[in-house]
């Protein structure tokens, strides 16, 4: 007998993170075999989109010619085959950016820091908000994510840094969003470059449009060292 | 620096296969979207396939059914296979990685590529 | 599948004129779109991507613009070094189709 029919690939063009109102393409690569494709959305009525496959069989395409807070969530495709319907892939997660406006980024003391002091970024937004992300350009994904212990919403967060190195320095951006849907965030922040003087190492930034965040997962964020802000949020690793 | 190598033969005949290996350095091919591209001699820019790191694939459909773009993650390299050549299939053949996403700009466009090797297709 | 044509496809300008090059596609993309500098002889180089922001290192004359269908490539002030031909790419969706170029020379 034979096994389970292998689980496809499932990935998003151009990427899984878009801005509102852009497009985006939903690919699921299966087998030559496959004669129909079916992609599920997490809290939605399955299936969510069924497509037959594109020559030469082994790959459908499911398309969202503009972004919105409908389309935000985790993914999964299957396809069936004479003998049946696969595993299911891998999860995708499709984040939405520009769900809320953005919020103020902001250094204390001040952004330029000297290697071994202490410096926090302060994420700051108009309306108050249970979840802040701090992510920095290069890493592939957000360095901190804090959330209310309690479902409290806040107006900030606070991410500590200490003792800075020169690793630390490079450009930041925050982002706010709720908790009922991790899948929604808002608009970036401006960017804030974080310069760290005294190092052995050059601790000239790079220009902000030169940084370059990877497409997949197994760049590792860079991790700031500190203690847990006294914010009433507590810091989750991602 | 990341940076991108073509290699290959340079001549091949009528009806063969034309096989080529872009070998990724200073950086890791497990991320982003790897492509190859040609250009004939005097003419454009023509995209003749992706392979995704998960070895996820999309080519160009006037290419497709001879097309096989392959990634070999323990050698960083990714390879081109073009069967059924002919002498249309002459030009330099350029690998290139279209780059990641910026949270404040977006999507790159391909920010690095090979310098390029050129394939003849001849008897 | 989703054509990229570019127009004109070649121009001759003076040194220090503005220079536009336009490229249209036959339907959305969105902000999908880099375009492309390539000299006499040598590799493509990215000059913008996201429609509008120019890649590192490269000059502040050259600006693009554009979202959907319709995307400009400007070059403020055309200096000698710039004579090269210029592609446009989609990347919203396979297949990432290019523009046929435009060749730009100087007057």
């Known amino acids: 007998q034979a096994g389970p029919l292998p689980k496809p690939t499932l990935w998003a063009e151009p990427g899984s993170v878009i801005s509102w109102g852009n497009s985006v393409t939903i690919w699921c690569q299966g087998t030559l075999e496959a004669r129909e494709y079916r992609l599920d959305k997490e809290e939605s009525p399955a299936p969510w989109d069924r497509q037959n496959p594109l020559e030469p069989k082994n790959k459908a395409r499911f398309s969202i010619p503009s972004m919105t807070e409908d389309y935000a969530g985790r993914y999964r495709c299957y396809y069936r085959s004479p003998v049946g319907w696969s595993q299911p892939s891998d999860p995708l997660e499709l984040v939405m950016t520009g769900a809320y406006s953005k919020p103020t980024l902001s250094a204390l003391p001040s952004p330029l820091v000297t290697s071994g002091k202490s410096v926090t970024l302060l994420c700051q937004s108009r309306s108050p908000m249970d979840t802040f992300l701090l992510i920095k350009e290069r890493a592939a994904h957000p360095l901190l994510h804090l959330r209310s212990e309690h479902g409290a919403q806040q107006h900030q967060a606070e991410f500590p840094m200490s003792p800075v190195t020169s690793v630390h320095g490079g450009t930041y951006r925050c982002f706010s969003s709720h908790g009922f849907s991790h899948y929604l965030l808002s608009h970036p922040s401006d960017p804030l470059e974080l310069i760290v003087s005294g190092s052995l190492e050059d601790p000239r930034p790079s220009p902000t449009r030169s940084v370059s965040t990877a497409a997949g997962p197994e760049d590792q964020p860079l991790m700031p060292t500190g203690s847990v802000p006294h914010s009433g949020l507590r810091r989750h690793w991602e | 620096q990341v940076q991108l190598q073509e290699s290959g033969p340079g001549l091949v005949k009528p009806s063969e296969t034309l096989s080529l290996t872009c070998t990724v350095s200073?950086?890791?091919?497990?991320?982003?979207?790897w492509s190859w591209i040609r250009q004939p001699p005097g003419k454009g820019l023509e995209w003749i396939g992706y392979?995704?790191?998960?070895?996820?694939?999309n080519y160009n459909p006037s290419l497709k059914s001879r097309v096989t773009i392959s990634v070999d993650t323990s050698k960083n390299q990714f390879s081109l296979k073009l069967s059924s050549v002919t002498a249309a299939d002459t030009a330099v053949y350029y690998c290139?990685?279209?780059?990641?996403?910026?949270?404040?700009?977006?999507?790159?466009?391909?920010?690095?590529w090979g310098q390029g090797t050129t394939v003849t297709v001849s008897s | 599948d989703i054509q990229m044509t570019q127009s004109p496809s070649s121009l001759s300008a003076s040194v220090g004129d503005r220079v536009t090059i336009t490229c249209r596609a036959s339907?959305?993309?969105?902000?999908?779109l880099a375009w492309y500098q390539q000299k006499p002889g040598k590799v493509p180089k990215l000059l913008i991507y996201?429609?509008?922001t120019l890649q590192s290192g490269v000059p502040s004359r050259f600006s693009g613009s554009g979202s959907g269908t319709d995307f400009t490539l400007t070059i403020s002030s055309l200096q000698p070094e710039d004579v090269a031909t210029y592609y446009c790419?989609?990347?919203?969706?396979?297949?990432?189709?290019f523009g046929q170029g435009t060749k730009l020379e100087i007057k």
């Open positions: 290139a990685r279209r780059g990641g996403y910026s949270y404040g700009y977006g999507y790159y466009g391909m920010d690095v």
């Open positions: 200073g950086g890791s091919i497990s991320s982003y979207f």
């Open positions: 392979i995704y790191y998960s070895g996820s694939t």
């Open positions: 339907q959305g993309i969105s902000n999908y």
């Open positions: 996201a429609a509008s």
């Open positions: 790419q989609k990347y919203n969706s396979a297949p990432w189709t």
